[in-house]
Every structure is written in structure tokens, then in C-alpha cells.
Interface confidence: low
Amino acid sequence: EEELQVIQPDKSVLVAAGETATLRCTATSLIPVGPIQWFRGAGPGRELIYNQKEGHFPRVTTVSDLTKRNNMDFSIRIGNITPADAGTYYCVKFRKGSPDDVEFKSGAGTELSVRAKPSAPVVSGPAARATPQHTVSFTCESHGFSPRDITLKWFKNGNELSDFQTNVDPVGESVSYSIHSTAKVVLTREDVHSQVICEVAHVTLQGDPLRGTANLSETIRVPPTLEVTQQPVRAENQVNVTCQVRKFYPQRLQLTWLENGNVSRTETASTVTENKDGTYNWMSWLLVNVSAHRDDVKLTCQVEHDGQPAVSKSHDLKVSAHPKEQGSNTAAENTGSNER
């Protein structure tokens, strides 16, 4: 009779993570008597996956009933496959021996490859806010995918970005892989509503890429522009001076009025108006009693925006010898000075 052969018909098997892998194995003869064992890997460090004779292997089931006398099918199923299960599996026939069974013949091996989806990409931006015209970096990370081939693209508001660097780790063979990409984005004043998107395409996603997003509203700081103007008189001897704070983001802003360098009032931006581009406008006013001043008054609107150094704009209010003329716009001039 011809000597027993162990046949593993599949050179390779490809399985999705979470699925069940079927590893096929048949023997060509019932003789010699002895159990079958399955191993992952070869040599002294091989890992026992299934032993027909003894042991507990909760993830492994046999395809046919191994207790039947004439059974020659030693195929197994391994449930809930993960990338860590990848490797070459050998079906090995043992001959009954005393005290231990002796390895008789091994199959050629079946390489199990596991496909795993990448995790949802996580996009993170810089720790500190930056102002328009600055270049900021965003990172995108996705993990746990297999095989290694993957494509990553960056977009800003639907427009593809080209200034980025991507690495897939590890470089060599691994059960699963990670991708890390850094993109450089130049901020503009209109970016409060902008989004940066990282898109990852992988064989497991079948044309439906995963996306991670970051809102530039978390990254950008648009500094305000200030304008101080004198309004028509509200009452005799009173001048209304307004400070228009325009196009700022985020909303966190504190304004201080100074009269001749002395703090007159401090307030926090509250009922702001929002512009189409997502920036804010705010206005504060100061009623100045001209009769209380004998000399010209220097009024300063000082704004501290989002914890940044204060910016200010001043207005010189000329105190005339004729109080009744104070109402006219000629009674004051906006020097337009900009102090930091």
C-alpha cells in the first residue's frame, strides 16, 4: 500500500477579520494509526493550534467527525479571525508511539492572510491657534489594517492638498499596519468655516473611503480690526464715541476704554453679530461728558482678543471754549493712531 500523504490543497487562504477561516487537510490513508495536529509556523517554535488527541481549543472546530474510524478529513475551522492569526498553518500526522506519538508526515502548509479594515481616521491639528497666512500642520492616523496597501488623500473644503507626507508602519511584514500622515495648510481669513479632511482608501472598504475631519474653527484666530468714531451729540455737553471691533474669531474678547490713559470701563464681548465668513463684529460706545474736561481728551479703545497682547486705537477729543459747539464733528478729530 502507498505511504500516507498529508494533503493541504490550499496554498493560501484569505479571510476577513472577524470571519471564520477554513483550513483544509486530508490524508490519503488510514495507516499508520495516530492523531493529527495543526501548527502555526514550522520548527521548534511552532505554535499548537489543534490536537486531535487532547487539549481544549475553543476557537477551533473540525469540519468532519474525527472520531469515525474511516475519517481521513482533518480540516478545521478557526473562528473570529484577527490579524494576529496570520501565518502558515501545517497539518501534521503523528504515528502512535510509546510513551509519545511520533511525527510522521506534514502537509505543505496553508498561508492564512487576514484582511482587516483600517480604523476611522483621526485628524488632529495644532495645539495653539494661528492667524491667517500662517502654515499649520494637521496629522491623520489610522490603524489595524491589513494588507499593507493603502491610499491616503487630504482635502481642504473639497480641494485636494498636495503638501503632505505619509508613512505606513511597520516597513516589514506584520499582522497589521498603521498609517500616519502630516499635511501643511495655509490659513486664510475666510477659514473659520473651513474643514480639513483626511480620506483613507483600502481594499476592505471597496470604494467607500473612510474620512476624518478637523474644523479650522478650532485652529484659526482672526485678529480684530478697530475703528473709533465720534457720533453726533446725544445731549448738550455729551459726546458719544464708538469703537467698532470687526472681523474677529473666536469670540473671546475684552474691551477697555481709557480716558487720558486712565481706565474708564471694561467689558466683555457678548451680543456680537456674526459675519457670513464666521467672524464676529462688535461695537462698544462711551458717553463722554465734555463739560467735565478742561483740556483735550485722548480716548483709547483697547482690545484684548483671545488672550493675545492688546491692540488699541485712539481718538483725540478737542475740548472747545464754546461747549455748545461740541456737537459738531469738527469738535473732535480721529487721529487714527494704532498703538500696541
Epitope: 476592505t204 472598504l205 471597496q206 470604494g207
Partner: antibody, heavy 123, light 107 residues
Framework: QIQLVQSGSELKKPGASVKVSCRAG????????MNWVRQAPGQGLEWMGF????????TYAQGFKGRFVFSLDTSVSTAYLQIGSLKAEDTAVYYC????????????????WGQGTLVTVSS | DIQMTQSPSSLSASVGDRVTITCRAS??????LAWYQQKPGKAPKSLIY???YRYIGVPSRFSGSGSGTDFTLTISSLQPEDFATYYC?????????FGQGTKLEIK
């Protein structure tokens, strides 16, 4: 070469069910999503939905939820469309069509089509 | 759903003619547009993807153009085997939708 081979024509009575098969050849079924497209007699093409052949997860277009089921048998590289409680208006040619690709972010264009299966529902 | 409108619905032309079929989307689909050719009793054949790219084996006389909402399929010099019905399809948004078709007949 790549081909999608569909099962033959079917004549069914109203209320019956039918299962149309689409066997993938020349590539690995689980690499590309499989779409199903309906064409009623003398009419245009209508997308029914698709099945992610990697996860087995189906997505159905609005008019095809309930009586229509997409499934797979990866061991025989075959995708299936089953229609239950057949009605006369289900009479049509049903096509399977492979999604173009995955690495190129172009997942909704179809590159290969089956030859079509005519399902006739008549009492 | 995104509506795809083709024009004309049918046209007659002669061998050697240059023919243009247009397809309009009810909203922006970027370049996620494909063109298919179908002959009577046959399955559709894929011609163009991403609005402008020909599939391997598709003759160079077929060309696609456009982006956003307006697209065209041009056949530079009609051959006898080109008489068929042509469909556009958007795949920017689910559900995927087709145009109603343009039937190209021999004059």
C-alpha cells in the same frame, strides 16, 4: 479574463420567489463590491443597491427594501439577488455589475457587467 | 436623489459624423460620472469613468468631458458598431442614478 456569469431566465408566478446568481471569474470576489441593476422592458437602468463583498453588508436603494435580498457565497465566488412575493411589475432584466475599484476613490462606477437575467412574472 | 437628464433623448446620425450627447445633474457631482453603451438585448458596456477616463479597450473616438453638473460624451467619428443607447450615471451620492438614455440611430 474577468467575467460575471449570471443564471438563466426565469418564469415565475405572482407571489413566488426567485434567486438570481452572479458568478465572478478571473478575480477575487471579495475584492470588489457587487451592484445590482434593474431594467424593465423598454426602460432605462435603475440601481437597486450593492453588497460589500468583504463584509457581506448590503445597501439597498429606497424602492428595493423589503422583498429584495443581496447575499454571497464566497466559497463559490457567487453573489445572489433574491426577490420574494413577486409581482408583475418585477418583470425585468436584472444585471450584476462590479464596482470599479477601491484604491482610486472611485467606488461607484461599474467596470464589468453580467450578461443579465430575465425574470418574467406572469400568471 | 440626484436627477440625471440626458439630451437629446434620441438622435439620427451617419457613419463618420461627430456626435455629442449631454448629461446634466440636478446638483454638483464633481467628476463622479460614468458613461455606458447598451445595444438591444445586451448588457451595458462601460465606456468612461471619472467623467473623462476611458476604460481599457474603449476606442479613442469616445471621449468624455465636464465636471460639476454638465457633462458630455463625444464620438468623434461614428462607426457602424456605435449605434446603441448611451447612459450617463452619477456616483457622487447614494442612491446612484442613471440618465434616461440617449438612443443613437442610423440616419
Amino acid at each position: 479574463q474577468i467575467q460575471l456569469v449570471q443564471s438563466g431566465s426565469e418564469l415565475k408566478k405572482p407571489g413566488a420567489s426567485v434567486k438570481v446568481s452572479c458568478r465572478a471569474g478571473g478575480y477575487t470576489l471579495t475584492d470588489y463590491a457587487m451592484n445590482w441593476v434593474r431594467q424593465a422592458p423598454g426602460q432605462g437602468l435603475e440601481w437597486m443597491g450593492f453588497i460589500n463583498t468583504y463584509t457581506g453588508e448590503p445597501t439597498y436603494a429606497q424602492g428595493f427594501k423589503g422583498r429584495f435580498v443581496f447575499s454571497l457565497d464566497t466559497s463559490v465566488s457567487t453573489a445572489y439577488l433574491q426577490i420574494g412575493s413577486l409581482k408583475a411589475e418585477d418583470t425585468a432584466v436584472y444585471y450584476c455589475a462590479r464596482t470599479r475599484g477601491y484604491y482610486d476613490f472611485d467606488g461607484g462606477a461599474f467596470d464589468y457587467w453580467g450578461q443579465g437575467t430575465l425574470v418574467t412574472v406572469s400568471s | 436623489d440626484i436627477q440625471m437628464t440626458q439630451s437629446p433623448s434620441s438622435l439620427s446620425a451617419s457613419v463618420g459624423d461627430r456626435v455629442t450627447i449631454t448629461c446634466r445633474a440636478s446638483q454638483n457631482v464633481g467628476t463622479h460620472l460614468a458613461w455606458y453603451q447598451q445595444k438591444p438585448g445586451k448588457a451595458p458596456k462601460s465606456l468612461i469613468y471619472s467623467a473623462i477616463y476611458r476604460y481599457i479597450g474603449v476606442p479613442s473616438r469616445f471621449s468624455g468631458s465636464g465636471s460639476g453638473t454638465d457633462f458630455t460624451l463625444t464620438i468623434s467619428s461614428l462607426q457602424p458598431e456605435d449605434f446603441a443607447t448611451y447612459y450617463c450615471q452619477q456616483y457622487n451620492t447614494y442612491p446612484l442614478t442613471f440618465g434616461q438614455g440617449t438612443k443613437l440611430e442610423i440616419k
